[in-house]
Amino acid sequence: EVEKTACPSGKKAREIDESLIFYKKWELEACVDAALLATQMDRVNAIPFTYEQLDVLKHKLDELYPQGYPESVIQHLGYLFLKMSPEDIRKWNVTSLETLKALLEVNKGHEMSPQVATLIDRFVKGRGQLDKDTLDTLTAFYPGYLCSLSPEELSSVPPSSIWAVRPQDLDTCDPRQLDVLYPKARLAFQNMNGSEYFVKIQSFLGGAPTEDLKALSQQNVSMDLATFMKLRTDAVLPLTVAEVQKLLGPHVEGLKAEERHRPVRDWILRQRQDDLDTLGLGLQGGIPNGYLVLDLSMQEALS
């Protein structure tokens, strides 16, 4: 806490300018009017204040706005944003995407801090849903943003926002998150033709059910092995050898290299060996010819 001391004669700040960098902390406290600071926040960023001086400026704003800063001030915080705590940010009401962008720019190139996470949470909650423009902005700054949301939060993403999602934005999403996102993507891309549809939907297929994979197998999509390996095991298991062959097209040869890994391993265990042999890949571990499988779930448990 800076002591309350009178401003020396002739030092009263008339505007926020570079002369203030020569002020001691107590002089800044005594000589800079908080209301002046608030109206000229846009100048602060251009002045090379020390961290200690920024602490004083923050303190002045806190005193002026104990209930939280107005958006006109927030938009121009610049590097002062790095001084804010999550508790400070929870008091804010940020509605402008421009304000959000300005503050994200300050943190650019760094990991998502607790302050940024709180800011984004406040902004999204204020908007009511994660619209396309917001998602565009957030994924541009943080490609992993979408996958940092819980499945519950992803449920409130409208299908129209899915157009903003790039494949790399889904890299760290888990099956449960993709399970929520996939139906939205299916809805968003439903009017596209076969090949274009597959290009767009491919990144979301980790959430696809068996019936959708069967439908894709009829469309000559040539799914790559990396995508196949991310499919839900329970969705892959019911697929026949012929369906997997059609689904993968020329990439079917890659099954051999993945035969010990899920979901390929589990899928092999559910297929008849003579069906697997038709692929000519030397895949082993299917149900021996002549065996009658009465309970596939038992077969899975035994494996």
Epitope: C147, S150, P151, E152, E153, L154, S155, S156, D171, T172, C173, D174, P175, R176, D179, V180, P183, T233, D234, R262
Partner: antibody, heavy 118, light 113 residues
Framework: EVQLVESGGGLIQPGGSLRLSCAVS????????MTWVRQAPGKGLEWVSV???????YYADSVKGRFTISRDNSKNTLYLQMNSLRAEDTAVYYC????????????WGQGTLVTVSS | DIVMTQSPDSLAVSLGERATINCKSS????????????LAWYQQKPGQPPKLLIY???TRESGVPDRFSGSGSGTDFTLTISSLQAEDVAVYYC?????????FGQGTKVEIK
């Protein structure tokens, strides 16, 4: 304060039907992923069913085709409709809130006992 | 389905002593893309519903005493009670939420010696 209160349990004959209710307060049931978990007398916990906030549902293989999970948003209540009941369905049934939809459960009701016996 | 196996089935520990419960999954519950272990621990006292203690294998739920800690990765996990208190007498369950259906261990009963 978050509260989940189950009701609807009781003694029922094999082949019969029962509907369990879970009255929720402290949050809106439609905004959360909600789950039923059961526990046979003296035994461990078994997951039964989930309903996503978006409405998608999943069931354990042991109850698929017999049980239906649903919710009434206006009453802020979760349901489990249980048909073709079997002796092995005898258990305390808990409704639980799935934390963020990740699959672990941060709030549980006190449970309601379902006994299937002739 | 992923099978969860706890050991021991029961455990008697003196007050103030350390209690250790192990949980093993039939396949890894570590999701490599986000480096998270999809494992939770619950405590259940007689006549009560389970109570969440730990999630993501090592994150303590709000309000849970810091004598409870979770560790491990992949297929092998441990719940440790650093200094057993009388109120810790209960059955403890591990649970994976890596894949649907979520599955629980058979439980470990902790008693006072």
């Amino acid at each position: 304060e978050v509260q989940l209160v189950e009701s609807g349990g009781g003694l029922i004959q094999p082949g019969g039907s029962l509907r369990l209710s879970c009255a929720v307060s402290g949050f809106t049931v439609s905004s959360k992923f909600m789950t039923w978990v059961r526990q046979a007398p003296g035994k461990g916990l078994e997951w039964v069913s989930v309903i996503y906030s978006g409405g998608k549902t999943y069931y354990a293989d042991s109850v698929k085709g017999r049980f239906t999970i649903s919710r009434d948003n206006s009453k802020n209540t979760l349901y489990l409709q249980m048909n073709s009941l079997r002796a092995e369905d005898t258990a305390v049934y808990y409704c639980a809130r799935d934390s963020g939809g990740w699959g672990y459960f941060d709030y549980w009701g006190q449970g309601t006992l379902v006994t299937v016996s002739s | 389905d992923i099978v969860m196996t706890q050991s021991p089935d029961s455990l008697a520990v003196s007050l103030g002593e350390r209690a250790t419960i192990n949980c093993k999954s039939s396949q890894s519950v570590l999701y490599s893309s986000n480096n998270k272990n999809y494992l939770a621990w619950y405590q259940q006292k007689p006549g009560q519903p389970p109570k969440l203690l730990i999630y993501w294998a090592s994150t303590r739920e709000s309000g849970v005493p810091d004598r409870f800690s979770g560790s491990g990765s992949g297929t092998d996990f441990t719940l440790t009670i650093s200094s057993l208190q009388a109120e810790d007498v209960a059955v403890y369950y591990c649970q994976q939420y890596y894949s649907t259906p979520p599955t629980f261990g058979q439980g470990t009963k902790v008693e006072i010696k």
